[in-house]
Interface confidence: low
């Protein structure tokens, strides 16, 4: 028998695939500064291979550390507006449990659209991250300029 | 015998290692908004394991879903020019088959000269994507400022 | 035996789980560019598991192709002063062992005051990378808006 | 050359439906958001609906929501809007427009067909 | 009653220069785009984003916004600008909404 089998074998559904991408559903009423995301097939190109949806928000299924990146542009925004609207925020962030309330990733429009950026960080099962934009501006939902979505990458 | 080798066991051959990592070559003649790439060692840094170039776009070799990630930095920019020829956009998408044909990913370059982001997506063998970058303003070849890559993340 | 055990199995620990993610430890002295990193559970959400940190620079433990990534927000930082400061830019690269170095990523700020990017790139045991911020401007220490990592994606 | 083509207007009575087609040639169909906006005999431009790229987000304005349905192929260049429950203020030059895809942008109509007659009368 | 105020009519005399505003509160936060249509015609862009103009628009279009207002200037009306003059924006959901429409003589 072949060395690499005498060593630890990794089974298929162990690999930890989880992985989700999904697109903007809504903003929130006033004083709720969170992006409300949806996800699967049906909408288009987004998807949830393991992470669910809880009211909007993404919860993690299992532990590890994941890759979590985001785009987000700003709707009817030109560089005169973004500046004009200053500051407009957004920022990725562990909301729940709250003992592990944390922010995540975090950028300001400044004079542009649109902010992306990725990073890779330690989710536990049952974490609940939230994207809040704050200022006076709406994200588009163009499906291609705002997307949110997470990646597990190892144990 | 071991547990996890009474489950399914994953060869190598099948991890889908696809990956691609590419440089601009040159853009398209006029009416032709799309940047045409190369790859490979002799080239410097990039890369093809798996996707292929036709005709300086990229073909996928294997179903999946992928990390797409991009940068695109304009040639000869400040932000002064960046505005004045404004708007200078960067989109990338599936170009063929034509029935699939959809826009994966959109950004505009405002007052800035560099774009850059990443999304996760569904591909599926023989998808070709495109890079169009529409505006009067060319990319720069530098291989640190300009590229454009794919990396097999599941099945 | 079924036909997957049949072929090259894929022990665990082969799989190059070599992964970081790093945040801002301190800039240096007068005329060393250089971004110093630092990581670890006890900092909060940054880590190490393969690469090293050298005088705060990342080197690599394993050969591959590597997703790198990096974010950086300049602190005390609105356009206006990314504009009156400009150039500020960052680059990363291989800065040792000298017959390798070469710039991977490079982004300037322009009227923003966040850059980021990613890239794949390959990789060998003992390069070490070092991220260039050059101009007057300093960057945010911020976990959430300066970062630094590199993901192990194949062979 | 940007061409948008309308066809499938005409008369029809109160309550009854009409489909009109949009057929979009020279330019890369499947990046643009797209809306049909409508001219009522002497009067000015009304908005309608409009739908993302991917065709899996639609919006409508409230004086068609529940009546009007827009849609599209992207794989024949083609957008649609099916009007049922028509009412007689519905009469109007329909157009199919292009969004320029600045789309972070307020929508801005750069391409515009010759538009198609609705009627609608007993 | 359209969201986007702007004048009925407009009169300016050959050469001369002409100005349409459009008042809304929606321009306080958003772009304004404006249109020219003539009689039979469908609409054609003539200026984006309060004050860009695209290819093929003579120079003598021009836009500006300040708060709540937007106006397209006309320098040296010619003959063939008359026709009529749509201001457009968005509402809060990103909606397109229009002005009522000026119509434009040049006399």
């Known amino acids: 028998q072949r060395f690499a089998q005498a060593q630890q074998q990794l089974p298929l559904e162990s690999l930890g695939w989880d992985v989700a991408e999904l697109q903007l559903n809504h903003t929130g009423p006033q004083q709720d500064p969170r992006l409300y995301w949806q996800g699967g097939p049906a909408l288009g190109r987004s998807f949830l291979h393991g992470p669910e949806l809880d009211k909007g928000q993404l919860r993690i299924h299992r532990d590890g550390i994941y890759m979590v990146h985001i785009q987000v542009t700003l709707a009817i925004c030109s560089s005169t507006t973004a500046s004009r609207h200053h500051p407009t925020t957004l920022a990725v962030g562990i909301c729940s449990p709250a003992s592990r309330s944390i922010s995540l990733l975090r950028l300001s429009f400044h004079q542009g659209c649109t902010i992306a950026s990725q990073r890779l960080t330690p989710l536990a099962r049952g974490d609940t991250l939230c994207t809040n934009l704050t200022g006076t501006l709406l994200p588009s939902r163009n499906t291609d300029e705002t997307f949110f979505g997470v990646q597990w990458v190892r144990p | 015998q071991r547990f996890a080798q009474a489950q399914q066991q994953l060869p190598l051959e099948s991890l889908g290692w696809d990956v691609a990592e590419l440089q601009l070559n040159h853009t398209g003649p006029q009416q032709d908004p799309r940047l045409y790439w190369q790859g490979g060692p002799a080239l410097g840094r990039s890369f093809l394991h798996g996707p292929e170039l036709d005709k300086g776009q990229l073909r996928i070799h294997r179903d999946g879903i992928y990390m797409v990630h991009i940068q695109v930095t304009l040639a000869i920019c400040s932000s002064t020019t960046a505005s004045r020829h404004h708007p200078t956009t960067l989109a990338v998408g599936i170009c063929s088959p034509a029935s699939r044909s959809i826009s994966l990913l959109r950004l505009s370059f405002h007052q800035g000269c560099t774009i850059a982001s990443q999304r996760l997506t569904p591909l599926a063998r023989g998808d070709t994507l495109c890079t169009n970058l529409t505006g009067t303003l060319l990319p720069s070849r530098n291989t640190d400022e300009t590229f454009f890559g794919v990396q097999w993340v599941r099945p | 035996q079924r036909f997957a055990q049949a072929q090259q199995q894929l022990p665990l620990e082969s799989l190059g789980w070599d992964v970081a993610e790093l945040q801002l430890n301190h800039t240096g002295p007068q005329q060393d560019p250089r971004l110093y990193w630092q990581g670890g559970p006890a900092l909060g959400r940054s880590f190490l598991h393969g690469p090293e940190l050298d005088k705060g620079q990342l080197r690599i433990h394993r050969d591959g192709i590597y997703m790198v990534h990096i974010q950086v927000t300049l602190a005390i930082c609105s356009s206006t002063t990314a504009s009156r400061h400009h150039p500020t830019t960052l680059a990363v690269g291989i800065c040792s062992p000298a017959s390798r170095s070469i710039s991977l990523l490079r982004l300037s700020f322009h009227q923003g005051c966040t850059i980021a990017s990613q890239r794949l790139t390959p990789l060998a045991r003992g390069d070490t990378l070092c991220t260039n911020l050059t101009g007057t401007l300093l960057p945010s220490r911020n976990t959430d808006e300066t970062f630094f990592g590199v993901q192990w994606v194949r062979p | 050359e940007v061409q948008l083509v309308e066809s499938g207007g005409g008369l029809v009575q109160p309550g009854g439906s009409l489909r009109l087609s949009c057929a979009a040639s020279?330019?890369?169909?499947?990046?643009?958001?797209m809306n049909w906006v409508r001219q009522a005999p002497g009067k000015g431009l009304e908005w309608v609906s409009d739908?993302?790229?991917?065709?899996?987000?639609?919006y409508y304005a409230d004086s068609v929501k529940g009546r009007f349905t827009i849609s599209r192929d992207n794989a024949k260049n083609t957008l649609t809007l099916q009007m049922n429950s028509l009412k007689p203020e519905d009469t109007a030059l329909y157009y199919c427009?292009?969004?320029?895809?600045?789309?972070?942008?307020?929508?801005?109509?750069?391409?515009w067909g010759q538009g198609t007659q609705v009627i609608v009368a007993s | 009653q359209s969201a986007l105020t702007q004048p009925s009519t407009v009169s300016v005399s050959l050469g001369q220069t002409a100005r349409i505003t459009c008042r809304g509160d929606?321009?306080?936060?958003?772009?304004t785009n404006w249109y020219q249509q003539k009689p039979g015609q469908a609409p054609v862009l003539v200026i984006y984003?309060?004050?860009s103009r695209p290819s093929g628009i003579p120079e003598r279009f021009s836009g500006s916004s300040s708060g709540a207002t937007a106006a397209l200037t006309i320098s040296g009306a010619q003959a063939e600008d008359e026709g009529d003059y749509y201001c457009?924006?968005?509402?809060?959901?990103?909606?397109?909404?229009f002005g009522g429409g000026t119509h434009l003589t040049v006399l």
């Open positions: 984003d309060d004050d």
């Open positions: 427009v292009r969004d320029a895809g600045y789309s972070n942008h307020v929508p801005i109509f750069d391409s």
């Open positions: 020279g330019f890369t169909f499947s990046v643009y958001y």
């Open positions: 739908i993302n790229n991917e065709g899996g987000t639609t």
């Open positions: 929606s321009l306080e936060r958003y772009g």
């Open positions: 457009q924006s968005a509402d809060s959901s990103g909606n397109a909404v």
